[in-house]
């Protein structure tokens, strides 16, 4: 579809007379038929094809022609038509004098003609004016003349419609050949697939607009190549969606349950060194001089009465020191300058000579002791606190400080930790030394049996074009990451293959 | 030959939310050349776009229609489906699904033989 | 919002030329597809981008746009033509249908 168009610029009939050589009076008052078909090497009167356009009166005699005429005319003259422009015509443009208004073929008598030339040849598509000029032997006609498109037309022939459109139908303009020419950030064949955001990642990523990046279900971050870990991990990443890949010292399915709660706590004071010995457990060893079971306690050397026969302790820095009575040396005063003479026995006890006198032993009552007598029995002497309870004299009896997990008057009980029941879903539980453990029945797990285990949606293999599956253990369901030029939930679908028309 | 079918409830109280499913079968709903859309015609009336829908979960919808609709993909089933909320006597209508051809300027080339959809208490 | 008007009713004697117009402003920017239906079935497209037939459909039916009017004849038309017609076209990112042109074959 185009228009051919005749634009008339001046017509010269200086002697007013018709091509029959009479004159017109008063004046030629002239107007134009045009006649426009298919190429003819003779060009012959008939039909005209390719259309017909007739002028309002232009002028008298000789006269230019402006661009856009007065009157109704139209200057360029248009002539549409409706088909492939074949690259050939022949033109027949006739002048005739109007005597009247009526112009039509039928009003006017056969002598009225002024001037009539006919023009064959080729002619391309284009915006440039051809210029001819006729001459006869009394009037002179110069005129230009071209082939266009209409609009929404292209190519050369004017055979192509492309019409712009900015929809999601396409996003492109017409190049002049009819070809699509892409508005900035879409592409495809019919320009209606966004380009997403540089760098988003190809398989995790998708946009419905240029420069965008959404991400497919697992992946996060702004070019959706970061997986999103399973919902609910801790101390963990992933590398694929949805695992949960414990840091060093966590472990559990959410990466939850401390592994290192000496370096993640410090629980042990006083210098002492700590050892992890399962979860959220860990043993203090203390440095001399401290106890307890985070060593938090400073142990006084003298508490052990290791002064003998009467000497008196003395806390020091780097631990003790005992100040002996008269007739006693050594560090425990435990070295005598005494004999049975000098009754040394304290509290009735008896004195024996030993070594010719040279020295004594005192055999003592009940409930004292000391190489004297001189110490009331300490009944922690004995270590009769079990599981490495900790003894206190208190007066006349003895006190066991147990152990956390053990009771009892000598902390020969073992604490059950079992005893209220801390497995749930029908965990059995096993009372242990340090604590006590879940033995957990199919479909649970963690530390008391508390977290339901995902069952694993991948084990059917339901993806498809060998795609990677992960198990949503949030929903017990899969996700398929699907290779390059598949989609679908389970990737069973290739993108972007011709389409299939039904014609 | 692909075939596109409209399933759901024929009769939606007032005020209550109609929902339709179209299978299509015998082309894949994940090609890149095609939209999915879905048009009403009330008794007696003219055809009424509603909106459409790409493989990938992008959507248009009519703006007179468009707080009220929601349409949603579902590429593993070679579904989509239409939700229309506060229903009212004027949504009664038969209800098409239709493919919306890229390759023909969005020229509708193959439909549902459409539902009747009748809002009454 | 964008209109499509259509005459709503236009009669034709078997063998003769039905013309149905389409009127939208500035429609000839924009592609024109026509449907057929038939009472009691579903729309079928005959024609798209202004005046392409799907296979499949006579070549009595053709298109043509221009200006603000696209138009759909019917050369030769036969009593199985007798439909409602709709034009419709894509205003950004919206179909438009037109109201409907009843085609009687008398």
């Known amino acids: 579809s185009g228009v051919f168009q005749l634009q008339l610029q001046e017509f010269i009939n200086e002697r007013g007379v018709l091509a029959s050589g009479r004159p017109c009076e008063p004046g030629c008052r002239t107007f134009f038929r045009v006649c426009l078909k298919h190429f003819q090497a003779v060009v012959s009167p008939g039909p005209c094809t390719f259309g017909t356009v007739s002028t309002p009166v232009l002028g008298t005699n000789s006269f230019a022609v402006r661009d856009d005429s007065s009157g109704g005319g139209r200057n360029p003259l248009q002539l549409p038509f409706n088909f492939t422009w074949p690259g050939t015509f022949s033109l027949i443009i006739e002048a005739w004098h109007a005597p009247g208004d009526d112009l039509r073929p039928e009003a006017l008598p056969p002598d009225a003609l002024i001037s009539k030339i006919a023009i064959q040849g080729s002619l391309a598509v284009g915006q440039n004016w051809l210029l001819d000029e006729q001459t006869s032997t009394l009037t002179r006609l110069r005129y230009s003349y071209r082939v266009i498109c209409s609009d929404n037309y292209y190519g050369d022939n004017c055979s192509r419609l492309c019409k712009k459109r900015n929809d999601h139908f396409g996003h492109y303009v017409c190049q002049p050949d009819g070809n699509l020419s892409c508005l900035p950030g879409w592409t495809g064949e019919y320009c209606q697939q966004p380009i997403c955001l540089s760098g988003c990642h190809e398989q995790n990523g998708y946009c419905s607009k240029p420069a965008e990046c959404l991400c497919r279900p697992g992946w996060q971050g702004r070019l959706c190549n970061e997986c999103i870990p399973h919902n609910g991990c801790r101390h963990g990443t992933c590398s694929t969606p949805w695992q949960c890949t414990c840091d060093e010292g966590w472990g559990g399915l959410f990466c939850d349950q401390d592994l290192n709660y000496c370096t993640h706590h410090s629980p042990c004071k006083n210098g002492a060194t700590c050892s992890n010995s399962g979860q959220r457990s860990y043993t203090c060893t203390c440095r001399p001089g401290y106890t307890g079971v985070d060593c938090e306690l400073e142990l006084s050397e003298c508490d052990s009465n290791p002064c003998r026969n009467g000497g008196s302790c003395k806390d020091q820095e780097d631990g003790y020191h005992c100040l002996c009575p008269p007739g006693y040396y050594g560090l425990h005063c435990e070295h005598s300058t005494l004999s049975c003479a000098d009754s040394p026995c304290f509290n009735g006890g008896s004195c024996r000579e030993r070594n010719q006198g040279a020295n004594y032993a005192c055999e003592c009552p009940p409930n004292f002791t000391g190489s004297n007598c001189e110490k009331k029995v300490d009944r922690c002497t004995s270590n009769p606190c079990a599981n490495g309870g900790q003894c206190l004299n208190r007066g006349p009896s003895r006190m066991c400080r147990c152990r956390p997990g053990f009771t009892g008057t000598y902390c020969e009980l073992h604490v059950s930790d079992c005893a209220r029941n801390p497995c749930a879903h029908g965990g059995t539980c096993h009372d242990l030394e340090n604590g006590l453990m879940c033995t957990c029945p199919a479909g649970f797990s963690g530390r008391r049996c508390e977290v339901r285990t995902s069952i694993d949606a991948c084990a059917s293999s339901p993806c498809f074009n060998r795609a990677t599956c992960y198990t949503d253990l949030s929903t017990d369901t899969f996700v398929c990451n699907c290779p390059y030029g598949f989609v679908g939930s389970r990737c069973e679908f290739p993108v972007g293959l011709p389409p299939s028309f039904p014609w | 030959e692909v075939q596109l079918q409209e399933s759901g409830p024929g009769l939606v109280k007032p005020s209550e939310t109609l929902s339709l499913t179209c299978t299509v079968s015998?082309?894949?709903?994940?090609?890149?050349?095609?939209?999915w859309g879905w048009i009403r015609q009330p008794p007696g009336k003219g055809l009424e776009w509603i909106g459409d829908?790409?493989?990938?979960?992008?959507?248009y919808y009519n703006p007179s229609l468009k707080s009220r609709v929601t349409i949603s993909v579902d590429t593993s089933k070679n579904q989509f489906s239409l939700k229309l909320s506060s229903v009212t006597a004027a949504d009664t209508a038969v209800y098409y699904c239709?493919?919306?051809?890229?390759?023909?300027?969005?020229?509708?080339?193959?439909w549902g033989q459409g539902t009747l959809v009748t809002v009454s208490s | 919002s964008y209109e499509l008007t259509q005459p709503p009713s236009v009669s034709v004697s078997p063998g003769q030329t039905a013309s149905i117009t389409c009127s939208g402003q500035?429609?000839?920017?924009?592609?024109a597809s026509w449907y057929q239906q038939k009472p009691g079935q579903s729309p079928v497209l005959v024609i798209y981008?202004?005046?392409k037939r799907p296979s499949g459909i006579p070549e009595r039916f053709s298109g043509s746009n221009s200006g603000d009017t696209a138009t759909l004849t019917i050369s030769g038309t036969q009593p199985m033509d007798e439909a409602d017609y709709y034009c419709?076209?894509?205003?950004?990112?919206?179909?438009?249908f037109g109201y409907g042109t009843k085609v009687t074959v008398l």
């Open positions: 239709a493919r919306e051809a890229v390759p023909l300027g969005g020229g509708s080339d193959y």
């Open positions: 015998g082309g894949s709903i994940s090609s890149s050349s095609y939209y």
């Open positions: 829908i790409y493989y990938t979960g992008s959507t």
């Open positions: 500035r429609l000839g920017d924009k592609y």
């Open positions: 981008e202004d005046s």
């Open positions: 419709q076209a894509w205003d950004r990112d919206t179909g438009v």
